[in-house]
């Protein structure tokens, strides 16, 4: 008799999830010599232990604590780049500007980026059929709790000038319901962080509007100012040129506004 299985609204665990996490861990420790001491099998065991045999709507930050300990890493607190709804460009930027870090440039962020996972209560099985959707099923699911945990701690670690890349093509350039808007903004430490600098990335070639005047950016400025952190904002009118000028800052065309 086939066992009854809970049907969730979201996609199931990414196929070959254990192999993917393990392979990513090995690759990361090879690329980053300062992390070569990490035991990737222990990392996988801790990751697995956070959600296997647990109800996928009842996951807590505490479940991920063993994994957090194994992911201990030096991150220069004044070189942190946050992003919202524009992950690819943020990652392209830190691949060029190697001294800056997004969350996905850390071991823990790299392991989980773009993956989905969940288990089932009282069985050691990984659920490859479906996982809880944050809106339709429950917020305390394995993926959401993981990202909330690491995002909070990443923001808490930040200091001096913190940069955030925002998508100027979206109706809500700053979205209070994004991870940045709901978690990271509220966990920047005013005693450590002097300024939050927003980079608003324009989508259209001929878009010359000042998106720093957008109402949602003003809302972000208000939230940040109330937390005793200064706010500044820059338009990035030409993201392609922006990246090119990060690669080749001495290029003569890079002195004009981008």
């Amino acid at each position: 008799v086939p066992r009854w299985r809970q049907q969730w609204s979201g996609p199931g665990t990414t196929k070959r999830f254990p192999e993917t996490v393990l392979a990513r861990c090995v690759k990361y420790t090879e690329i980053h010599p300062e992390m070569r001491h990490v035991d990737c099998q222990s990392v996988w065991d801790a990751f697995k232990g956070a959600f296997i045999s647990k109800h996928p709507c009842n996951i807590t930050e505490e479940d991920y604590q063993p994994l957090m300990k194994l992911g201990t890493q030096t991150v220069p607190c004044n070189k942190i780049l946050l992003w919202s709804r524009i992950k690819d460009l943020a990652h392209q930027f830190t691949q060029v500007q190697r001294d800056m870090f997004t969350l996905e440039d850390t071991l823990l962020g790299y392991l989980a980026d773009d993956l989905t996972w969940c288990g089932e209560f009282n069985t050691s099985k990984i659920n490859y059929q479906s996982c809880p959707d944050w809106r339709k099923d429950c917020s305390n699911n394995p993926v959401s709790v993981f990202w909330k945990t690491v995002s909070r701690r990443f923001a808490e670690a930040a200091c001096d000038v913190v940069h955030v890349m925002l998508n100027g093509s979206r109706s809500k350039i700053f979205d209070k319901n994004s991870t940045f808007g709901s978690v990271e903004v509220h966990n920047l430490q005013p005693e450590k962080v002097q300024t939050l600098e927003a980079w608003v990335i324009h989508g259209g070639r001929e878009d010359s509007r000042d998106l720093c005047q957008d109402p949602t950016i003003k809302e972000l400025e208000s939230i940040i100012s109330k937390r005793n952190i200064q706010f500044s904002c820059k338009n990035i009118y030409r993201p392609d040129k922006f990246l090119q000028c990060v690669k080749n800052p001495e290029d003569s065309s890079c002195t004009s506004e981008i």
């Epitope: 957090m68 300990k69 201990t72 030096t74 607190c77 701690r153 808490e156 430490q189 005693e191």
Partner: nanobody
Framework: EVQVLESGGGLVQPGGSLRLSCAAA????????MSWVRQAPGKGLEWVSS????????DYADSVKGRFTISRDNSKNTLYLQMNSLRAEDTAVYYC??????????RGQGTLVTVSS
Amino acid sequence: EVQVLESGGGLVQPGGSLRLSCAAAGFTFSNFAMSWVRQAPGKGLEWVSSISGSAGTIDYADSVKGRFTISRDNSKNTLYLQMNSLRAEDTAVYYCADGTGPFFDYRGQGTLVTVSS
């Protein structure tokens, strides 16, 4: 700006004890959880222990549990690490840092603990 100064390291025989101190400045010490992390020669960063701002929550790495004790004196803006039953594998530079990790940017020079006979 967060500033920390670690002290108390030294050479000690296996089984011996040391007490590390971390004097903090530039921030409201009692508002911040604090941690000890260490880096052994040729190795990566290892989290050792954390303590919440009020000292109500304390956590240790399995490798030091039962041997090390973290504490703090908020009136003196100082974090401590009492290290007992020291082993050769505890040899490392010890740093104190704000927060509970896993992301650390330690601001001090650290204090070297060498466990050797």
